[in-house]
């Protein structure tokens, strides 16, 4: 035999008190399959979660953040405070990142700057608190009698073209 | 790739102004980053002053602080380094220099380095 139930379509939810009958979701709830037995409670966004999409009868409500914090976990289950680039989130707030790493995002936290010398290369830009160092040609490029010889044109990966 | 053409060079008195050009064709997209780099005779290549071709952020060489200034026009694909109260010491072949690979996605996790062909400064009286 058939579930009854099994007819019940999303946004309804088959109940027990009325023989079974397929009945909608009563407000601020959902269903987003069909044959539920209840529905479930709407999310609500309070607070620094502010609402993305409204709660329907078929899915739930969704969250993102208030502007100055950014959503954390899966389905935004949290709030975490923003810093500015060149700053890390810690216990006591936003600090500004040490001499020698850098952020450059609002959130996440403080990188060491790349060491050119590490990969045989020589530093052409500095870092900065919100930028990596950019590092510039070998120190053998630089050296008398290097030739100033420019690098054969690097292979296109397929489905790339230049601009 | 990248094609970088030197321009602007010379003879110059001590105190004297010079404004060298760049200008970048090709893949110029990939740049990330620029660079004036200098080499007396017999000496190594140094770098003068670079620059970041997104923000516009600049480095100089204690050297010439305070006398030099590196601009770019992305509009127009070409990096300058204009050269105020020059000396003899900064006397040299100017190389343009070009730094490709982060942040372009068909290059994505390649660099490559791009030197012009040099232009020469004199600085004498």
């Known amino acids: 035999l058939q579930d009854p139930c099994s007819n019940c379509p999303a946004g309804t939810f088959c109940d027990n008190n009325r023989n079974q009958i397929c009945s909608p979701c009563p407000p601020n709830s959902f269903s987003s399959a069909g044959g539920q037995r209840t529905c479930d409670i709407c999310r609500q966004c309070k607070g620094v979660f502010r609402t993305r999409k409204e709660c329907s009868s078929t899915s739930n409500a969704e969250c993102d953040c208030t502007p100055g914090f950014h959503c954390l976990g899966a389905g935004c289950s949290m709030c975490e405070q923003d810093c500015k680039q060149g700053q890390e989130l810690t216990k006591k707030g936003c600090k500004d990142c040490c001499f020698g790493t850098f952020n450059d995002q609002k959130r996440g936290i403080c990188r060491p700057w790349t060491n050119c010398s590490l990969d045989g290369k020589s530093v052409l830009v500095n870092g900065t608190k919100e930028r990596d160092v950019v590092c510039g040609p070998s120190p053998a490029d630089l050296s008398p009698g290097a030739s100033s010889v420019t690098p054969p044109a690097p292979a296109r990966e397929p489905g790339h073209s230049p601009q | 790739q990248v094609q970088l053409v030197e321009s602007g060079g010379g003879v110059v008195q001590p105190g004297r102004s010079l404004r060298l050009s760049c200008a970048a064709s090709g893949s110029t997209f990939s740049i990330v980053a620029m660079g004036w780099y200098r080499q007396a005779p017999g000496k190594q290549r140094e770098l003068v002053a670079s620059i970041i071709t997104g923000d516009g952020d600049t480095n100089y060489a204690d050297s010439v602080k305070g006398r030099f200034t590196i601009s770019r026009d992305n509009s127009k694909n070409t990096m300058y380094l204009q050269m105020n109260s020059l000396k003899p010491e900064d006397t040299a072949v100017y190389y343009c220099?070009?730094?490709?690979?982060?942040?372009?996605?068909?290059?994505?996790?390649?660099?490559?380095?791009?030197w012009g062909q040099g232009t020469q400064v004199t600085v004498s009286s």
């Open positions: 220099y070009a730094r490709t690979g982060e942040g372009s996605s068909w290059l994505e996790g390649h660099e490559y380095d791009y």
